[in-house]
């Protein structure tokens, strides 16, 4: 039994880090493998993660962590019974994938303006709370070509757009994701999408 693709891990910079790897053949990850992880400092405890299958030869482990700080560094040991398959380390602050934003809402009652709001996925004391920027994806359910991304580079979790920039009388969906430039994070997963019917008053044309 060998590791084909070594574990790669990302942290939500709060409570979970997720490690994925591939074995050289079909593996029952939960019965055959264990991932041990330990914070590097005196008297820290070793924790054991039981991996789950992620495709035939793929495994995934969710490592529970206390509040992450930038200095945290973990040793990782992947075991198959008494055999050490791989040894490595992981610094959560250097491999951050933010949590997805939540509670995306489209407010359509503001005089032909669409107001999209969502919630920051971090509590105020978390470092990422004040460092997230967002991308909002809006698309038409009727027309796959009508697909647009709005970059929200300010901190407020909201976006205003004129309803007239979208077609009237059809349904749209929106979703949002986050990243933090300060930690050079990857993008978060997309939030669940929300749907609305876009309608606005066409301006009266005088001839």
């Amino acid at each position: 039994m060998k590791v084909l693709q070594r574990p790669t891990c990302v942290s939500d910079y709060m409570s979970i880090s997720t490690c994925e790897w591939k074995m050289n053949g079909p593996t029952n990850c939960s019965t055959e493998l264990r991932l041990l992880y330990q914070l590097v400092f005196l008297l820290s405890e070793a924790h054991t993660c039981i991996p789950e299958n992620n495709g035939g030869a793929g495994c995934v482990c969710h490592l529970l962590m206390d509040d992450v700080v930038s200095a945290d560094n973990y040793t990782l040991d992947l075991w198959a019974g008494q055999q050490l398959l791989w040894k490595g380390s992981f610094k959560p602050s250097e491999h951050v994938k933010p949590r997805a934003p939540g509670n995306l809402t489209v407010h359509t009652n503001v005089s032909d303006t669409l107001l999209l709001t969502w919630s920051n996925p971090y509590p105020p004391d978390n470092y990422l709370y004040n460092h997230l920027t967002y991308a909002v994806n809006i698309w038409s359910e009727n027309d796959p070509a009508d697909f647009r991304i709005y970059n929200v580079t300010y901190l407020e979790p909201s976006l205003r757009i004129a309803a007239s920039t979208l077609k009237s009388g059809i349904s749209y969906r929106a979703r949002v994701r986050a990243w933090a430039q300060c930690y050079n994070t990857t993008w978060s997963e997309w939030s669940p999408s929300t749907k609305w019917h876009n309608s606005y008053r066409e301006p009266f044309e005088q001839h």
């Epitope: 820290s44 789950e52 206390d66 949590r99 939540g102």
Partner: antibody
Framework: QVQLVESGGGLVQPGGSLRLSCVAS????????MNWVRQAPGKGLEWVSY????????YYADSVKGRFTISRDNAKNSLYLQMNSLRDEDTAVYYC????????WGQGTLVTVSS | DIQMTQSPSAMSASVGDRVTITCRAS??????LAWFQQKPGKVPTRLIY???SLQSGVPSRFSGSGSGTEFTLTISSLQPEDFATYYC?????????FGQGTKVEIK
């Protein structure tokens, strides 16, 4: 091995105060965020409060906000819950529980609020 | 605040039965969900975290699934020591909230 031992419970009248303590051993307390969780007699679990190891930030359940204060003394390996303006509905066994996500619990201390 | 609704609140089952408990969150919590077991007069112990990750030392007959707002705890073959009360917990945001509990009793 990890141990959490709560104390300070007892009988108190409505409107009174009580200070609970939780002494930790078997791990580096200063590196752990901590919680208080309570359970009223015959009822379910209710999270009460949290204090971060990283920032010292604190969070409270709405039911205790403004009345309870969580604190810690890393030099004494101790977690505290100062409970003021106690009400009948605060009667419960109070547990301290360690992060991440309540991996270790103390045995609890009973707080009875009654006249 | 996020509400967690567990069902059923109580159930009777026999040794060997397959038992399923569900937990519904009032809003999306991704996979930030844990399951705890509590026996009478004892302290709760964590069975599952991150919705589906089995806590080390917990028998493999326990499993968790779900994401977003719908979650399930399954005991594949109920054992005598499994008669207890089970709670779900969301830790997606503060305040953290537990479900009201499901008591699994002997039929």
């Amino acid at each position: 091995q990890v141990q959490l031992v709560e104390s300070g419970g007892g009988l108190v009248q409505p409107g009174g105060s009580l200070r609970l303590s939780c002494v930790a051993s078997g791990f580096t307390f200063s590196h752990s965020s901590m919680n208080w969780v309570r359970q009223a007699p015959g009822k379910g679990l209710e999270w009460v409060s949290y204090i971060s190891r990283a920032t010292g930030a604190v969070y409270y359940a709405d039911s205790v906000k403004g009345r309870f204060t969580i604190s810690r003394d890393n030099a004494k390996n101790s977690l505290y819950l100062q409970m003021n303006s106690l009400r009948d509905e605060d009667t419960a066994v109070y547990y301290c529980a360690r992060e991440p996500v309540f991996d270790y619990w103390g045995q609890g201390t009973l707080v009875t609020v009654s006249s | 605040d996020i509400q967690m609704t567990q069902s059923p609140s109580a159930m009777s089952a026999s040794v060997g039965d397959r038992v399923t408990i569900t937990c519904r969150a009032s809003q999306d919590i991704s996979n930030y969900l844990a399951w705890f077991q509590q026996k009478p007069g004892k302290v709760p112990t964590r069975l599952i975290y991150a919705a589906s990750s089995l806590q080390s030392g917990v028998p493999s007959r326990f499993s968790g699934s779900g994401s977003g707002t719908e979650f399930t705890l399954t005991i594949s073959s109920l054992q005598p020591e499994d008669f207890a009360t089970y709670y779900c917990l969301q830790w997606s945001s503060y305040p953290r909230t537990f479900g009201q509990g499901t008591k699994v009793e002997i039929k």
